[in-house]
Interface confidence: medium
């Protein structure tokens, strides 16, 4: 805590400017009016205050707004935002996308801090859903943002927001997250024609079921191996050799290099060796000729 001392004669601040940067802690506390600070917050970020001084300025704002800062102040916090704790931020009511952008700019180029995570959480909860403009903004600053959300949180993303998602935004998503996002993407892109649709849906296919992969195999999409390797194993296993060949097109040759990795390895184990041989890739490990394949899951369903 900064001790309360009288402001020396002639030092009372009439505006927030660079003349304050050589005020000692106690002089800042005594000579800067909190209300003046609040109305001239836009100046603070342009003045080279030290961290020690920023602590004093924050303390003054905390005293003025014990229930949380108003948005007019929050929008102009600048690098004073870095002095805020998640507890401070939980008191805020941030509704303007411009305010969010201004604060994210301060943290730009750095990993998401606990302050930023709390700010985003407050903002999204205040809006009720993750709309397109918000998602656009968040993924621009943090490409991995979507994949940091739980499947439950992702369920509040409206299909219209999916248009803002870029392939790199999904790089760190796990299958559970893609399971939630894929149906939204399918809905969002449903009116596009075949080749354009595939370009858009490709990054989401880690959440696609078998029947959708079968449908894609009929559309000459030429899926690359990197995309194929991210597909759900349980969705790939029922595909026939012919369907995989159609799905991959000229990229089918890449299966050889991936034959020891999932889902290719598990898929090979489910195919007849005769069928695999038709690919001419030397894939081994299929079901030998003359063996009967029992689908136990089907048998259980019937009984």
């Amino acid at each position: 805590e900064v001790e309360k001392t009288a402001c020396p004669s002639g030092k009372k601040a009439r505006e927030i400017d660079e003349s304050l940067i050589f005020y000692k802690k106690w002089e800042l506390e005594a000579c800067v009016d909190a209300a003046l600070l609040a109305t001239q917050m836009d100046r603070v970020n342009a003045i080279p205050f030290t961290y020690e001084q920023l602590d004093v300025l924050k303390h003054k704002l905390d005293e003025l707004y014990p229930q949380g800062y108003p948005e007019s102040v929050i929008q102009h916090l600048g690098y004073l935002f870095l002095k805020m704790s998640p507890e401070d931020i939980r008191k805020w009511n941030v509704t303007s996308l411009e305010t969010l952008k201004a604060l994210l700019e301060v943290n730009k180029g750095h990993e998401m801090s606990p302050q930023v995570a709390t700010l985003i959480d407050r903002f999204v909860k205040g809006r009720g859903q993750l709309d397109k403009d918000t998602l656009d903004t968040l993924t621009a600053f943090y490409p991995g943002y979507l994949c940091s959300l739980s499947p439950e949180e992702l369920s509040s993303v409206p299909p219209s927001s999916i248009w803002a998602v870029r392939p790199q935004d999904l790089d760190t998503c796990d299958p559970r997250q893609l399971d939630v996002l894929y149906p939204k993407a399918r809905l969002a892109f449903q009116n596009m024609n075949g080749s354009e649709y595939f370009v858009k849906i490709q990054s989401f296919l880690g959440g696609a079921p078998t029947e959708d992969l079968k449908a894609l195999s009929q559309q000459n999409v030429s899926m690359d191996l990197a995309t194929f390797m991210k597909l759900r194993t349980d969705a790939v296993l029922p595909l026939t050799v012919a369907e995989v060949q159609k799905l991959l097109g000229p990229h089918v040759e890449g299966l050889k290099a991936e034959e020891r990795h999932r889902p290719v390895r598990d898929w090979i184990l489910r195919q007849r060796q005769d069928d695999l041989d038709t690919l001419g890739l030397g894939l081994q490990g299929g079901i030998p000729n003359g063996y009967l394949v029992l689908d136990l899951s089907m048998q259980e369903a019937l009984s």
Epitope: F22, A46, Y51
Partner: antibody, heavy 126, light 107 residues
Framework: QVQLVQSGAEVRRPGASVKISCRAS????????IHWLRQAPGQGPEWMGV????????????AYAQMLQGRVTMTRDTSTRTVYMELRSLRFEDTAVYYC???????????????WGQGTLVTVSS | DIQMTQSPSSLSASVGDRVTITCRAS??????SAWYQQKPGKAPKLLIY???TLQSGVPSRFSGSGSGTDFTLTISYLQSEDFATYYC?????????FGGGTKVDIK
């Protein structure tokens, strides 16, 4: 790439003044401050002051280290992206290499120096 | 003013050695410290800021640690180009101050 280019070496008599320039080139779009530091032979750098090199919401008036107050003035010419440091009433102990250096405003408050000028040797000699 | 006291003031080392330089602030400065390398006739070069963050383009053999009053610069495997003088700096409060330097020379 940012470059800070300083004016050449100066020799002055005690009591005289010297004015050094520092011109920024390259990508100077990032918001930053320009600081002046000096380094006497065999010593560590000594911070002299800071100036906002562009006009902005703040007044743009510079701030100086108290040990130099009254003798130093920092100014800027925004049209040429040049800042100046004038030191008056020179003393023998002001003999040093004078540097301008940049600090960026952003993630953190701006007080470590990511780019430096090449230095200007000021010799005070009778 | 905050004093930054560096130790040792000089040290001799060989290529491949692990070198540690320490800096003590006269009062707590959180993690608002930086480290610079300076070679004769050249300006200082930023190595580390925020006590432990490596500046872009600086080799990973340099690392920094510490918080509060005690800070350390470590060179994990000394290279021939690392023989120089190293300075710590605090940027918690004005005036910004530097340590007296540590000269690292060849054994």
């Amino acid at each position: 790439q940012v470059q800070l280019v300083q004016s050449g070496a100066e020799v002055r008599r005690p009591g005289a003044s010297v004015k050094i320039s520092c011109r920024a080139s390259g990508d100077t779009s990032t918001r930053h401050y320009i600081h002046w530091l000096r380094q006497a032979p065999g010593q560590g750098p000594e911070w002299m002051g800071v100036i906002n090199p562009t006009t902005g919401p703040a007044t743009g008036s510079p701030a100086y280290a108290q040990m130099l107050q009254g003798r130093v003035t920092m100014t800027r010419d925004t049209s040429t992206r040049t800042v100046y440091m004038e030191l008056r009433s020179l003393r023998f102990e002001d003999t040093a290499v004078y540097y301008c250096a940049r600090s960026v405003v952003g993630r953190s408050a701006p007080y470590y120096f990511d780019y430096w000028g090449q230095g200007t040797l000021v010799t005070v000699s009778s | 003013d905050i004093q930054m006291t560096q130790s040792p003031s000089s040290l001799s080392a060989s290529v491949g050695d692990r070198v540690t330089i320490t800096c003590r602030a006269s009062q707590g400065i959180s993690d608002y410290s930086a480290w610079y390398q300076q070679k004769p006739g050249k300006a200082p070069k930023l190595l580390i800021y925020a006590a432990s963050t490596l500046q872009s383009g600086v080799p990973s053999r340099f690392s920094g640690s510490g918080s509060g009053t005690d800070f350390t610069l470590t060179i994990s495997y000394l290279q021939s180009e690392d023989f120089a003088t190293y300075y710590c700096q605090q940027y918690y409060s004005y005036p910004l101050t530097f340590g007296g330097g540590t000269k690292v020379d060849i054994k």
